[in-house]
């Protein structure tokens, strides 16, 4: 039975050109994490394998950095980075747990319009 739960950083609104950290944390299970995949839509961004370490997809190498921890740092954000990101925890013996984070990247002009939020 899968008893674990995934906690995420929560959704994030950021400004074009900035950088943000996406993080997930698996709790309430003793299952062993064998691999964590980070995906956006149907694209694989990065893999953190318990034995082999990190692999960043070539198309994201310039703007994606591993960590902190099992998280992912996205740099030089563009409006095209807006979308849903998934942290997919492969565990034994539980199976797969998935967390969802939505990242909204705003043009500076939009970010300033009526903005009273702190932008990362």
């Amino acid at each position: 039975m899968m008893t674990g739960t995934i906690e995420t950083t929560g959704n994030i609104s950021a400004e074009k050109g900035g950088s943000i950290i996406l993080q997930c944390h698996l709790s309430s299970t003793t299952a062993q994490v064998t691999q964590v995949n980070w995906e956006q839509q149907d694209q694989l961004l990065a893999i953190c394998n318990a034995d082999l370490g990190w692999h960043i997809s070539p198309s994201f190498k310039d703007r994606v950095a591993p960590g902190p921890g099992l998280g992912l740092t996205l740099q030089s954000l563009t409006v095209n980075d807006t979308g849903e990101y998934f942290c997919i925890y492969h565990t034994y013996p539980d199976g797969t747990y998935t967390g969802r984070i939505f990242l909204e990247v705003l043009e500076s002009s939009v970010a300033e319009h009526g903005a009273r939020f702190q932008i990362p």
Epitope: G10, L106, Q118
Partner: antibody, heavy 117, light 112 residues
Framework: EVQLQQSGPELVKPGASMKISCKAS????????MNWVKQSHGKNLEWIGL????????SYNQKFKGKATLTVDKSSSTAYMELLSLTSEDSAVYYC??????????WGQGTTLTVSS | DVVVTQTPLSLPVSFGDQVSISCRSS???????????LSWYLHKPGQSPQLLIY???NRFSGVPDRFSGSGSGTDFTLKISTIKPEDLGMYYC?????????FGGGTKLEIK
């Protein structure tokens, strides 16, 4: 002035599919995500999903995966929601709503869908 | 999914009253940057919902200052200082911090 103009009311038969449109004006269509919200029985509001007009990316409430399909036509600044395999449970008012920082700042006027044989 | 509980379900008022509506979430609505995406809406009969408050306490453009929002973590409140006829309708809170966004069940503001 920001405006979201939705298509008119629909009466459809069970098992059919239908598409609701939401035409945006008064702002840069690709600069904001577009959400869809269901209101059943004149009360409960449920988030169906959203689409990112700039890149076509989508995010769905798991409850509506397979029921709703979201698309956009950037050239006409129009968002669409197709509802599939309709049943009486799908009878509701559907709204499109623009979002900024995860709040829905402008809403369409709503489209009433009635599913009945 | 994050469960959002609104109280009361119904709020009978007289014009001029001050009222509070509560919104509680099943987990904290602060993201890792300390930003909380909690908004409030008024839905009047025959109209579309309208945004009143975003980011806990920021009034949307054109919203009168008799509306105010407060709270943090899992507990949030909408206050209306002097009820006017145009304030009657259904009030909803919405959490946008966690996927999927979820609405409270609504509070009906009606005349006693």
């Amino acid at each position: 002035e920001v405006q979201l103009q939705q298509s008119g009311p629909e009466l459809v038969k069970p098992g059919a599919s239908m598409k609701i449109s939401c035409k945006a004006s008064g702002y840069s269509f690709t600069g904001y995500t577009m959400n869809w919200v269901k209101q059943s029985h004149g009360k409960n509001l449920e988030w169906i999903g959203l689409i990112v007009p700039s890149n076509g990316g989508t995010s769905y409430n798991q409850k509506f995966k397979g029921k709703a399909t979201l698309t956009v036509d950037k050239s006409s600044s129009t968002a669409y929601m197709e509802l599939l395999s309709l049943t009486s449970e799908d009878s509701a008012v559907y709204y499109c709503a623009r979002s900024l920082r995860f709040s829905f700042d402008y809403w369409g006027q709503g489209t009433t869908l009635t599913v009945s044989s | 999914d994050v469960v959002v509980t609104q109280t009361p379900l119904s709020l009978p008022v007289s014009f001029g009253d001050q009222v509070s509506i509560s919104c509680r979430s099943s987990q904290s609505l602060a993201n890792s940057y300390g930003t909380t995406y909690l908004s409030w809406y008024l839905h009047k009969p025959g109209q579309s919902p309208q945004l009143l408050i975003y980011g806990i306490s920021n009034r949307f453009s054109g919203v009168p200052d008799r509306f105010s929002g407060s709270g943090s973590g899992t507990d949030f409140t909408l206050k209306i200082s002097t009820i006017k006829p145009e304030d009657l309708g259904m009030y909803y809170c919405l959490q946008g911090t966690h996927q999927p966004p979820t609405f409270g069940g609504g509070t009906k503001l009606e005349i006693k």
